[in-house]
Interface confidence: medium
Amino acid sequence: MMTGTIETTGNISAEKGGSIILQCHLSSTTAQVTQVNWEQQDQLLAICNADLGWHISPSFKDRVAPGPGLGLTLQSLTVNDTGEYFCIYHTYPDGTYTGRIFLEVLESSVAEHGARFQIP
């Protein structure tokens, strides 16, 4: 039975040209995290593998940096980066946990961060 929950940074906003950290945290389970995938819609941005380390998708390598931790830093943001991002935790023996973050990239200088929320 999957008992864990994913806590994410929730709905967030950032300024065009700036950077943002996407963070997820898996709690309430003793399962071993073997890999975390970061995806935007159907595109794989990056993976952090327990044995192999980080790999950034070639099409994003200039604008995506690994970390902090299992998180992901998006740089040089554009309005086109607005949308849903998913952290997918592959664990043993539980299986897969998924967290969702919605990022809005704003033209203005006012970018407010939303509250945290959880996805079971």
Epitope: N49, D51, L52, H55, S57, P58, S59
Partner: antibody, heavy 126, light 112 residues
């Protein structure tokens, strides 16, 4: 440090079943995307890929040998196994195991058969 | 199956000079994700094969930058510059676009 080591019977007779063991360290077959591959090298010849087993128990086989091959793993003991049934003198070769990460999961290929064992010499002779 | 054809079958090189090895696949190795699944391996005498280059031109960890790869689609080249004694062995190209993964027949590099 990633290491792999093959072990086998050394010599066996035609029609017998060849059982090979790959004992590895430095990585786990619990880890998403990882697997162990088996490759053989016929005496003085090139390399022939035989089979892979993946973290999720999926198996890939070389179709030319598929009906004779069985690959398996013992995740807890960091071992992978290959059985070849009904061996013939043509199966005399050095058998290697190697770490492999699933293509398209690890897009740049840096972990495709990136570390190999020392090889196990197998002779089929009557 | 994808056929991998290497040439020449053997090459003799004077230490300090360069060597070039060609590999041709019977089908394009370019995946829809933009990656070309072509690797080069070196098998030194009495040793196991070792990964030299992946994805046409990327050096594997710990490999000398005297090795370089190029090509696209179905035609690939491995160049060894300033050949040294330790470069002697058999070089194999391999495709892992699809199962069964297949190797070239190998190119034996010797010193003059």
């Amino acid at each position: 440090q990633v290491t792999l080591k093959e072990s086998g019977p050394g010599i066996l007779q035609p029609s017998q079943t060849l059982s090979l063991t790959c004992t590895f360290s430095g990585f786990s077959l619990r880890t998403y995307g990882l697997g162990v591959g088996w490759i053989r090298q016929l005496s003085g010849k090139g390399l022939e890929w035989l089979a892979n087993i993946w973290w999720d128990d999926d198996e890939y086989y070389n179709p030319s040998l598929k009906n004779r091959l069985t690959i398996s793993k013992d995740t807890s003991n960091n071992q992978a196994f290959l059985k070849i049934t009904n061996v013939d003198t043509a199966d005399t070769a050095t058998y290697y195991c190697a770490r492999i990460a699933r293509p398209h999961y690890y897009w740049d290929g840096r972990y495709i058969l990136d570390v190999w064992g020392q090889g196990a010499s197998v002779t089929v002779s009557s | 199956d994808i056929m991998m054809t290497q040439s020449p079958l053997s090459v003799a090189v004077t230490p300090g000079e360069s060597a070039s090895i060609s590999c041709r696949s019977s089908k394009s190795l370019l995946h829809s994700n933009g990656i070309t699944y072509l690797s080069w391996y070196l098998q030194r005498p009495e040793k196991s094969p070792q990964l030299l280059i992946f994805q046409i031109s990327n050096l594997a960890s710990g490999v000398s930058d005297r090795f370089s790869g190029s090509g696209s689609g179905t035609d690939f080249t491995l160049i060894i510059s300033k050949v040294e004694t330790e470069d002697v062995g058999i070089y194999y190209c391999m495709q892992f676009l699809e199962v069964p993964y297949t190797f070239g027949a190998g190119t034996k590099l010797e010193l003059k």
